[in-house]
Interface confidence: low
């Protein structure tokens, strides 16, 4: 009887062979059958499952001139770049007249050098700080034993001896390279070499040494930097803002910070050109030849109030009999703090100086004692903050009031019976 027509007789005359090889290998499985009549489509099974997207080709050769004669059918399954997922039992399958025929199995196995699933990665670490590196490899054949190398020197005497998938490094003091070797019965594969760059540790104990209205002196303790000396430290200051929300871990301020570099040692820096009576946040990082440390957390600091940098402006002083009317305007120069008020001093040629605290008003009427015959009366005004008095104005002579000159009504201020204090006159 013709092949393929009886249930007990398989049409297959050639079954798939076996392939065993390393990852990436290209190979071909073949099966051959002889059938009578129209050739069937050959399907491939892997571990009993039909391969829907198999890279197979089918060749059909007639053995006679009539379509009903026998045909030789050859199906070739190409495996390109052998992977672990390709391994298993392979068979050909055909449907012939309501009956299914399956070839004898062939086997595809993977056996070669170890294959890395995970390799050590480049990273930066702070000096003397523990970290872990990972390496993972597989066969087949198993087992796969790992051997870690640091700067090309093995960290154990044999594969599988010592740390395996995870290498715990208790700390480094110099930039080092790490790799791992994976060993199995077929040989050795070496991973990529990871460079672990040793950076300085984050500086510690950032603190204020002294404060001036427009400058802050800060100091810090440098962290360890391994065998690499620190080349410099960088300090950043940024204006604080209630809405800014610089938290301990927030990486960057919302505006361009004021950046200063300090040569080291000493681990100290004077930050100038700051605003008085202003909150700032500062942080520091130190750099070696290998790169910069991480920044410290932001430290809130504040410049103190200063005294006003200039005297009150546009002072005028007029006299009418026993009364003197003085008024002025706020200093144009920076106040360096919160203006608390003004001090006024007046003095005649042969009379003691009189000092008065005017408060925040910018005008005052003085009630002069005596008959008003004091000669060469002059007035000075200074603004003050919580930090103290600003510079005094130049002495302004008291001018006689001329009829027609407006003189508003002011609250009279009696001079104190004794001066509040005295300072060297101009």
């Amino acid at each position: 009887a013709p092949r393929g027509t009886q249930a007990e007789e398989s049409p297959f005359v050639g079954n798939p062979g076996n392939i065993t090889g390393a990852r990436g290998l290209t190979g071909t499985l073949r099966c051959q059958l002889q059938v009578q009549g129209e050739p069937p489509e050959v399907h491939w099974l892997r571990d009993g499952q039909i391969l829907e997207l198999a890279d197979s080709t089918q060749t059909q050769v007639p053995l006679g001139e009539d379509e009903q004669d026998d045909w030789i059918v050859v199906s070739q399954l190409r495996i390109t770049s052998l992977q672990l997922s390709d391994t298993g039992q392979y068979q050909c399958l055909v449907f012939l007249g309501h009956q299914t025929f399956v070839s004898q199995p062939g086997y595809v196995g993977l056996e070669g050098l170890p294959y890395f699933l995970e390799e050590p990665e480049d990273r930066t670490v702070a000096a003397n700080t523990p970290f872990n590196l990972s390496c993972q490899a597989q066969g087949p054949p198993e087992p796969v034993d790992l051997l870690w190398l640091q700067d090309a020197v093995p960290l154990a005497t044999a594969p599988g001896h010592g740390p395996q998938r995870s290498l715990h490094v208790p700390g480094l003091n110099k930039t080092s390279s790490f790799s791992c070797e994976a060993h199995n019965a077929k040989g050795v594969t070496t991973s990529r070499t990871a460079t672990i760059t040793v950076l300085p540790q984050q500086p510690r104990n950032l603190h204020l040494v002294s404060r001036q209205p427009t400058e802050l002196e800060v100091a810090w303790t440098p962290g360890l930097s391994g065998i690499y000396p620190l080349t410099h430290c960088t300090l950043q200051a940024v204006l604080s803002d209630d809405g800014m929300g610089i938290q301990a871990g927030e990486p960057d301020p919302p505006e361009e910070p004021l950046t200063s570099q300090a040569s080291v040692p000493p681990h100290q820096l004077r930050l100038g050109s700051l605003h008085p009576h202003t909150p700032y946040h500062i942080r520091v990082a130190c750099t070696s030849s290998q790169g910069p440390s991480s920044w410290t957390h932001w430290l809130p600091v504040e410049t103190p109030e200063g005294v006003p940098l200039g005297p009150p402006e546009n002072i005028s002083a007029t006299r009418n009999g026993s009364q003197a009317f003085v008024h002025w305007q706020e200093p144009r120069a920076p106040l360096q703090g919160t203006l608390l008020g003004y001090r006024l001093a007046y003095q005649g040629q042969d009379t003691p100086e009189v000092l008065m605290d005017i408060g925040l008003r910018q005008e005052v009427t003085l009630e002069l004692q005596g008959d008003g015959s004091v000669s060469n009366l002059t007035v000075c005004v200074a603004a003050y903050t919580a930090a103290g008095d600003g510079p005094w104005s130049l002495p302004v002579p008291l001018e006689a009031w001329r009829p027609g000159q407006a003189q508003p009504v002011h609250q009279l201020v009696k001079e104190p019976s004794t001066p509040a204090f005295s300072w060297p006159w101009w």
Epitope: V153, L155, T157, A158, H161, P163, P170
Partner: antibody, heavy 117, light 107 residues
Framework: EVKLVESGGGLVQPGGSLKLSCATS????????MYWVRQTPEKRLEWVAY????????YYPDTVKGRFTMSRDNAKNTLYLQMSRLKSEDTAMYYC??????????WGQGTSVTVSS | DIVMTQSHKFMSTSVGDRVSITCKAS??????VAWYQQKPGQSPKLLIY???TRHTGVPDRFTGSGSGTDYTLTISSVQAEDLALYYC?????????FGSGTKLEIK
């Protein structure tokens, strides 16, 4: 039975050289990493060198690096330690040892090296 | 280098007693510790590796334990033939280093 037998020790002057051998039997020599370990007169154990099973990789601590060379002949199942520029602190009993997967599982009986003028 | 410290140079015990020999590593060696026994006039012999795994043929009165930096070799019932020097060794990092040894004396 695993056997390791060292030979070649003796008295040598400082600056001199000596070559130790370790003949092995009872196991597949080419499958194992091997060591030399020494024991000082004060009974301290110091690891001196190791060699990979194929002989392609050797490693030495700083105390002997550049002066000692370890080698092996897998065809003869023999291990060697060439020692040069010897110092008095190299005086010790020298053992060869086999590395199992995790530790030095078999040691020879040792050969004594004395460096003295 | 990793330093292995055996704080007791000598330990005196009696036959049948339980004795523990300790060893401390200068850093975590993740149980990669071996113990060796050296009897007078003999070469060292491996007792324990990977902190607690007994080598072939080692009597079960010898047990190893520990993790991190602290390791112990315990002899549950000392026999006269256990008179020896005992060394610990780390096989975690090259260079491999040994402890200075503990001499077990039988009263």
């Amino acid at each position: 039975e695993v056997k390791l037998v060292e030979s070649g020790g003796g008295l040598v002057q400082p600056g001199g050289s000596l070559k130790l051998s370790c003949a092995t039997s009872g196991f597949t020599f080419s499958d194992y990493y091997m060591y030399w370990v020494r024991q000082t007169p004060e009974k301290r154990l110091e690891w001196v060198a190791y060699i990979s099973n194929g002989g392609g990789s050797t490693y030495y601590p700083d105390t002997v690096k550049g002066r000692f060379t370890m080698s092996r002949d897998n065809a003869k199942n023999t291990l060697y330690l060439q020692m040069s520029r010897l110092k008095s602190e190299d005086t010790a009993m020298y053992y060869c040892a086999r590395l199992s997967f995790y530790a030095m599982d078999y040691w020879g009986q040792g050969t004594s090296v004395t460096v003295s003028s | 280098d990793i330093v292995m410290t055996q704080s007791h140079k000598f330990m005196s015990t009696s036959v049948g007693d339980r004795v523990s020999i300790t060893c401390k590593a200068s850093q975590d060696v993740t149980t990669a510790v071996a113990w060796y026994q050296q009897k007078p006039g003999q070469s060292p012999k491996l007792l324990i590796y990977w902190a607690s795994t007994r080598h072939t043929g080692v009597p079960d009165r010898f047990t190893g334990s520990g993790s991190g930096t602290d390791y112990t070799l315990t002899i549950s019932s000392v026999q006269a033939e256990d008179l020896a020097l005992y060394y610990c060794q780390q096989h975690y990092r090259i260079p491999f280093t040994f402890g200075s040894g503990t001499k077990l004396e039988i009263k």
